[in-house]
């Protein structure tokens, strides 16, 4: 038998420095977690203790804090190189700055292979990107070789900016021939490493013949065996065992997100490459693990350039700004209300006596809200805090839509409610009531919108044939998160201001903020 230790991270989202327990900015260092310096300490400890170790990342290193805003991926390459990652799969967020924003800072600088079997380049890009990422890599570990095959969410064109010269194929269809190649190279220990979410990870384990282990990302899935060490509630045991169609037991793992945990999986293979046993757990990277001094010093050196962003107080909050995915992807959250209020405020244009304003409505995909802000840091809100909340560098745009399109959008908002998906809408100038007992596509039972052609704004039922102005992220205007109806049916689209700037301007103007959850989004059952 031969034993392999797989260390894995996913969805780190630019958390290079240690963070608070909820993965926002570290306030009380003695209770902070994660960060690359602490991760390195644990990785090195395991490398010294165990003979056959791989350190893998399942994508979405990009995007999430001021580090990415300023360094644009150079920080990812630098610190992943320093930690000596063995391989990485491309995530959807690796394309947030376009293909060039992936090639130059990361693909050309990474001293480890970057993988995806289901992304195919075409046109002029094909020769430019050739060899910079690979479908698979055979890594030598001890006296054996291990095949790593990569995959990326085929939804990436809807979630990021990969451009028109990359084709994202079905994961299973693309993976099978690459795994077959590895088998033909007499490589009999194969890891699928990728970024398509836990449901797809399980499907890959079930359907792709020859895959021994699946290391995933994208859905921020926390798996744990036993009593979990922090706030995250396990979605299942670690590893999660899937029985493949050909009768094998395939371990599937993921390690939550934000560098809070280091996935730790031990696999025992027989001489024919069959998995005999698998066990482990994510390791919570809490303050009991010291930060590596040399990596920490390097972080501090890189940090200097960020300080201009960090030190300037924009305003204060006297309430917790709840931007957690657990709230904003499931119900009205006060961070969503704050952002939508800022978006409307930024578009105040009193150009007609008949209208108090030309626009009263805001919609915002909950998945675009990426972090909370804790008020217990003297209430201070900085640009850095906002960059963690709104890390994508998007714009808040003005569109004109028919009421019928808005109704479709709100049905889409809850069509698969409960899976922590990003399309759940936060709102401003809208009151919506959902009945989740009804079938998808028929769950919006009340949709009232704030009038504009009025001296005293009030909520009136949405009219299907009326044309409304709405402020929304450019991501939604472009059909992101599955809002194809907006892209296809919008009547006018005007580009707006940078998202962080809109919110920072609003906070600076208000000086002290205290957004509440106030009944913009409600759930009910029964007749209306």
């Amino acid at each position: 038998a031969w034993e392999l230790t797989i260390l894995h991270t996913n969805d780190v989202h630019s958390r290079l420095e240690q963070t608070s327990e909820d993965s926002s900015k570290c306030v009380n260092a003695s209770r902070c977690m994660g960060g690359v310096a602490r991760l390195f300490t644990k990785v090195q400890q395991i490398r010294r203790a165990e003979p056959n170790v791989l350190l893998l990342d399942a994508g979405d290193q990009y995007q999430g804090t001021i580090w990415f805003t300023v360094y644009k991926g150079a920080e990812v390459a630098h610190f992943m190189n320093a930690l000596r990652y063995d391989a990485m799969a491309l995530g959807n967020h690796e394309f947030d700055n376009g293909v060039e924003g992936l090639i130059e800072p990361l693909l050309k600088e990474a001293k480890f292979p970057i993988l995806s079997a289901n992304i195919k380049a075409k046109g002029p890009l094909a020769s430019q990107i050739s060899g910079l990422y690979l479908p698979y890599k055979v890594l030598p570990v001890g006296d054996e070789v291990v095949g790593i095959v990569g995959y990326t969410s085929k939804e990436t064109p809807f979630l990021s900016n990969p451009g028109t010269n990359l084709v994202f194929e079905d994961e299973i269809t693309a993976l099978q021939p690459e795994v077959d190649k590895l088998k033909t190279l007499n490589v009999n220990k194969i890891i699928a490493l990728g970024h398509s979410g836990f449901e797809m990870d399980k499907l890959i384990a079930q359907k792709v013949r020859g895959v021994d282990v699946v290391v995933g990302g994208h859905s921020n899935t926390f798996l744990y065996t036993g009593n979990p060490p922090s706030k995250e509630v396990p979605a299942g045991k670690y590893p999660f065992i899937v029985t493949s169609d050909d009768g094998r037991k395939v371990p599937v793992v993921q390690a939550y997100a934000f560098g809070k945990y280091l996935g730790y999986l031990k696999i025992e293979f027989d001489e024919r490459g069959n998995v005999i046993s698998s066990h482990g757990n994510p390791i919570l990277l809490n303050s009991s693990i010291p930060e590596d001094p040399s990596i920490k010093a390097d972080i501090n050196k890189w940090r200097i350039k960020l300080d201009n962003y960090s030190t300037q107080e924009l305003g204060k909050t006297i309430v917790y700004l709840d931007g957690s995915s657990q709230s904003c992807r499931f119900r009205e959250c006060n961070m969503g209300n704050l952002i939508c209020d800022a978006m409307i405020n930024n578009n105040l244009r009193h150009t007609d006596e008949m209208f108090w304003n030309h626009v009263s409505m805001c919609i915002l995909n909950g998945g675009g809200i990426r972090s909370p802000i804790d008020e217990r840091n003297n209430g201070t809100i900085t640009w850095e805090n906002l960059a963690a909340v709104l890390p994508f560098g998007g714009t808040f745009d003005l569109v004109q839509l028919k009421g019928s399109t808005l109704k479709k959008a709100f049905e889409h908002s809850v069509h698969r409610y409960g899976q922590s998906t990003g399309e759940f809408l936060q709102v401003g100038g809208i009151h919506v009531v959902y009945d989740l007992s009804r079938k998808p596509g028929d769950r919006v039972v009340k949709l009232d919108v704030l009038c504009t052609k009025c001296r005293v704004p009030s909520y009136d039922p949405l009219k299907m044939d009326e044309v409304y102005k709405v402020i929304l992220p450019n991501f939604l205007a472009n059909g992101g998160d599955g809002f194809q109806m907006i892209k296809d049916e919008l009547l006018r689209h005007d580009s707006g201001d940078q998202d962080i700037n809109v919110v920072s301007t609003y906070i600076s103007k208000m000086k002290v903020i205290y957004p509440a959850v106030e009944g913009r989004i409600k759930f009910s059952t029964g007749s209306h």
Epitope: R84, D86, K108, A110, K111, F112, P113, G131, L134, P135, Y136, K137, V138, L139, P140, V141, G142, V145, K181, T184, L185, N186
Partner: antibody, heavy 118, light 107 residues
Framework: QVQLVQSGAEVKKPGASVKVSCKAS????????IYWVKQRPGQGLEWIGW????????KYNEKFKGRVTITADKSASTAYMELSSLRSEDTAVYYC???????????WGQGTLVTVSS | DIQMTQSPSSLSASVGDRVTITCKAS??????VAWYQQKPGKAPKLLIY???TRHTGVPSRFSGSGSGTDHTLTISSLQPEDFATYYC?????????FGQGTKLEIK
């Protein structure tokens, strides 16, 4: 573009050692295997071993184990092959080569002739 | 170790001819076979891998076929620059092994 440039020809006495270098450029050195291949005059090709600079893993052909040492200097993007206790049958051209994605030799150095003669 | 036996060891042909070189493996190597061209005093050049995948820049007159133990390199219409020695290699398992070579000469 990918380039592998090897050190110059060497003449050595039996029993001595020789160290051949292979400097890589035009790609990320750590991400691809470097293989060493031997070709005796007028003969075929023999795989000596590999090094994977990413984790400095080394594998030798059993036939060459004991007298060959393969190393790499990541900072210099250079691989080395040292052959000790030289004998006349070690007279050969030694090539370094790089993989495309494991196991076949896509790019080759120009070769280094090592002559063992008393 | 897997032995790779090439045939013929040498052959004479003319420009424009269709030429076939075969390689027999001592055990099943599936489609894990590569072909190289070597000219005197030069390093080998990769022509084909995975039995039939041409390396970047290799002319389409070079093709490979086979599976299991029997593999073939075909040059559909010989050009003057094709006269050289050709080697097959199995990339199925270590130690990677080569055929003894086929010298292609001008008739």
């Amino acid at each position: 573009q990918v380039q592998l440039v090897q050190s110059g020809a060497e003449v050595k006495k039996p029993g001595a050692s020789v160290k051949v270098s292979c400097k890589a450029s035009g790609y990320t050195f750590t991400n691809y295997y470097i293989y060493w291949v031997k070709q005796r005059p007028g003969q075929g090709l023999e795989w000596i071993g590999w090094i994977y600079p990413g984790n400095l893993n080394i594998k030798y052909n059993e036939k060459f184990k004991g007298r060959v040492t393969i190393t790499a200097d990541k900072s210099a993007s250079t691989a080395y092959m040292e052959l000790s206790s030289l004998r006349s049958e070690d007279t050969a051209v030694y090539y370094c080569a790089r993989d495309d994605n494991y196991a076949w030799f896509a790019y080759w150095g120009q070769g280094t002739l090592v002559t063992v003669s008393s | 170790d897997i032995q790779m036996t090439q045939s013929p060891s040498s052959l004479s042909a003319s420009v424009g001819d269709r030429v076939t070189i075969t390689c027999k493996a001592s055990q099943d190597v599936s489609t894990a076979v590569a072909w190289y061209q070597q000219k005197p005093g030069k390093a080998p050049k990769l022509l084909i891998y995975w039995t039939n995948t041409r390396h970047t820049g290799v002319p389409s007159r070079f093709s490979g076929s086979g599976s299991g133990t029997d593999h073939t390199l075909t040059i559909s219409s010989l050009q003057p620059e094709d006269f050289a020695t050709y080697y097959c290699q199995q990339h199925y398992s270590t130690p990677f092994t080569f055929g003894q070579g086929t010298k292609l000469e001008i008739k």
